[in-house]
């Protein structure tokens, strides 16, 4: 058993049929010695008396808010949560496996630039009685500071019969130099509590590996005389690291109709303009990627050909 | 500790092309190592990230773009002194700071070159003959060093009398290639910045 936060404790249980469970001793936070009784949750049934209560925790019915009282007055609370371990593996029931970029990916993180600011998000089908707490650091043995905000519900989606909820959090490395060469990864730890179930999820990454620029901005078309070609130009996204001559981007320019199976024109360039062939009912799209370190491409920025 | 914005004469900055080739060569070599050594811990997640130039050169700090010198987090650098007669810029206006930056890059390359050559000598003794260093990568390091054209004492190639541990050598190769790729990215960014200045 360990303390998650004040008056909240996590009991780690090996979860299998007829498991013996864990013996837990609760102590009432009071100078009083006599006349103390214990109850669980809203029940008035007295579980025991005395300054300490010893319980055998085997299942979720044994978890919950234990309260010690004296003469009708509440003295203190202890909330017990369960953390299940099945076949040596901690449970991951609360969050959904996003399977990208690999299986058992519960947390996904992205950064728009090298400033040390990043966003992580996760998915769940649970809608109520759910809380998250996020901590982060650079490295684990001698951790350097990363400050994370509160996790918030950022999107709701319908997936077949189920509703899916996306939560996200923004974090900022306390002292980040955009030009630095990372040797220690960022560690992100998410504590998830659903009713009386506790789970924790972690992710470890270098900012350079989670870079995904915003789409290029200000796409403009200029038809070329006596030709089917158009010159398309754009600018670096505002959120990208500066100076741009140091943090350079490369671009992919594509002309395509509404269907992905339609024919297309595609060209890659390091410049902020390109010449392509425009077709009726097609769109010109441009996306960006770090020129020197191939992490993710940005989403497309698009304009219609006409 | 930073690069002044004005200087290089018009025309292609001679080192840019070489630095692009360097990044390409080390990336290809790293990809090849990951594929060939698939049963060794050779991915970014699996290896320890070591920098053999740590406390010996200060490329990131010496080559910091002017715009980033206002960022306190970028300025906790170590002072290191370097020889300052580089020819990469082909310009009399080469500033002291820029020469410091380029000579730091030169020292990095020299250190990696020695490590890679020592390692290759060991890998050539491996009866499995599983992986060797790409001669193109070694040639590209050499070309960029020549373009930088700094005079400095040659570092003797380390020779080892004991029987090499090939497993350890291959893991060390992965560690070295990952670190060198990151440094090659920095070098490319620096050359691109200088070319645009």
């Amino acid at each position: 058993i360990w303390e998650l936060k004040k008056d909240v404790y996590v009991v780690e249980l090996d979860w299998y049929p007829d498991a013996p469970g864990e013996m837990v001793v609760l102590t009432c936070d009071t100078p009083e010695e006599d006349g103390i009784t214990w109850t669980l949750d809203q029940s008035s049934e007295v579980l025991g008396s005395g300054k300490t209560l010893t319980i055998q925790v085997k299942e979720f019915g044994d978890a919950g808010q234990y309260t010690c009282h004296k003469g009708g007055e509440v003295l203190s609370h202890s909330l017990l949560l369960l953390h299940k371990k099945e076949d040596g593996i901690w449970s991951t029931d609360i969050l959904k496996d996003q399977k990208e970029p690999k299986n058992k990916t519960f947390l996904r993180c992205e950064a728009k630039n090298y400033s040390g600011r990043f966003t992580c998000w996760w998915l769940t089908t649970i809608s109520t009685d759910l809380t998250f707490s996020v901590k982060s650091s650079r490295g684990s043995s001698d951790p350097q500071g990363v400050t994370c905000g509160a996790a918030t519900l950022s999107a709701e989606r319908v997936r077949g019969d189920n509703k899916e909820y996306e939560y996200s959090v923004e974090c900022q490395e306390d002292s980040a130099c955009p030009a630095a060469e990372e040797s220690l990864p960022i560690e992100v730890m998410v504590d998830a509590v659903h009713k009386l179930k506790y789970e924790n999820y972690t992710s470890s990454f270098f900012i350079r590996d989670i870079i995904k620029p915003d789409p290029p901005k200000n796409l403009q078309l200029k038809p070329l005389k006596n030709s089917r070609q158009v010159e398309v130009s754009w600018e670096y996204p505002d959120t990208w690291s500066t100076p741009h001559s140091y943090f350079s981007l490369t671009f992919c320019v594509q002309v395509q109709g509404k269907s992905k199976r339609e024919k297309k024109d595609r060209v890659f360039t390091d410049k902020t303009s390109a010449t392509v062939i425009c077709r009726k009912n097609a769109s010109i799209s441009v996306r960006a990627q770090d020129r020197y370190y191939s992490s993710s491409w940005s989403e497309w920025a698009s304009v219609p050909c006409s | 500790r930073n690069l002044p914005v004005a200087t290089p004469d018009p025309g292609m900055f001679p080192c840019l092309h070489h630095s692009q080739n360097l990044l390409r060569a080390v990336s290809n070599m790293l990809q090849k190592a990951r594929q060939t050594l698939e049963f060794y811990p050779c991915t970014s997640e699996e290896i320890d990230h070591e920098d053999i130039t740590k406390d010996k050169t200060s490329t990131v700090e010496a080559c910091l773009p002017l715009e980033l010198t206002k960022n306190e987090s970028c300025l906790n650098s170590r002072e290191t002194s370097f020889i300052t007669n580089g020819s990469c810029l082909a310009s009399r206006k080469t500033s002291f700071m820029m020469a410091l930056c380029l000579s730091s890059i030169y020292e990095d390359l020299k250190m990696y070159q020695v490590e890679f050559k020592t390692m290759n000598a060991k890998l050539l003794m491996d009866p499995k003959r599983q992986i060797f260093l790409d001669q193109n990568m070694l040639a590209v390091i050499d070309e960029l060093m020549q373009a930088l054209n700094f005079n400095s004492e040659t570092v003797p190639q380390k020779s080892s009398l004991e029987e090499p541990d090939f497993y350890k050598t291959k893991i060390k190769l992965c560690i070295l290639l990952h670190a060198f790729r990151i440094r090659a990215v920095t070098i490319d960014r620096v050359m691109s910045y200088l070319n645009a200045s």
């Epitope: 339609e262 595609r266 060209v267 890659f268 360039t269 390091d270 077709r279 | -």
Partner: antibody, heavy 118, light 107 residues
Framework: QVQLVQSGAEVKKPGSSVKVSCKAS????????LHWVRQAPGQGLEWMGW????????EYAPKFQGRVTITADESTSTAYMELSSLRSEDTAVYYC???????????WGQGTLVTVSS | DIVMTQSPLSLPVTPGEPASISCRAS??????LHWYQQKPGQAQRLLIY???QSISGVPSRFSGSGSGTDFTLTISSLQPEDFATYYC?????????FGQGTKVEIK
Amino acid sequence: QVQLVQSGAEVKKPGSSVKVSCKASGGTFSDYYLHWVRQAPGQGLEWMGWIDPENGDTEYAPKFQGRVTITADESTSTAYMELSSLRSEDTAVYYCARNKELRYFDVWGQGTLVTVSS
Amino acid sequence: DIVMTQSPLSLPVTPGEPASISCRASQSISINLHWYQQKPGQAQRLLIYFASQSISGVPSRFSGSGSGTDFTLTISSLQPEDFATYYCQQSNSFPLTFGQGTKVEIK
């Protein structure tokens, strides 16, 4: 199986014209760009131009502008390349090639030898 | 027009050995570079597109690398059926242009 089948070899006099055909099978004809590329004896490949069979849009290499006409007949899934004012240096194997991507070629025809000789 | 220069023009190789063909562009073309194989009496075959992207059905011994002005086609271990002429082609701008070709011959 996608295939491009070209017409047979031709011998032409200088100053005349030649029209080479390229019949496509497999896949929808108008879903692909169609290009013509030539190769003179012992020489490299030379791109001549492309057509979008869907709308008849064409683009020609400046070197052949005014002398080459590329057309397409959707009903027969056939593309044509006509080269006029032939000279001896136009002696070459002419290839048609196609792709859903405009700028490179994933399927090629077998080639048609055009000999220009007086 | 962008000029593509291949080297060497002729490459004698022993079967089983690796082979590398270089292609250089007269100006930067990013990764807009494609490789083809030509055998006598056969249609051209696309091997690699956009400098390094492999084609399904093309043996994995064929790989491409490069960006900007310098590109390489590598055949890791030459098989008897690989003796052919190889062409690079740029698609950075029109007119599309090809290298002069490299003939890989049996040593």
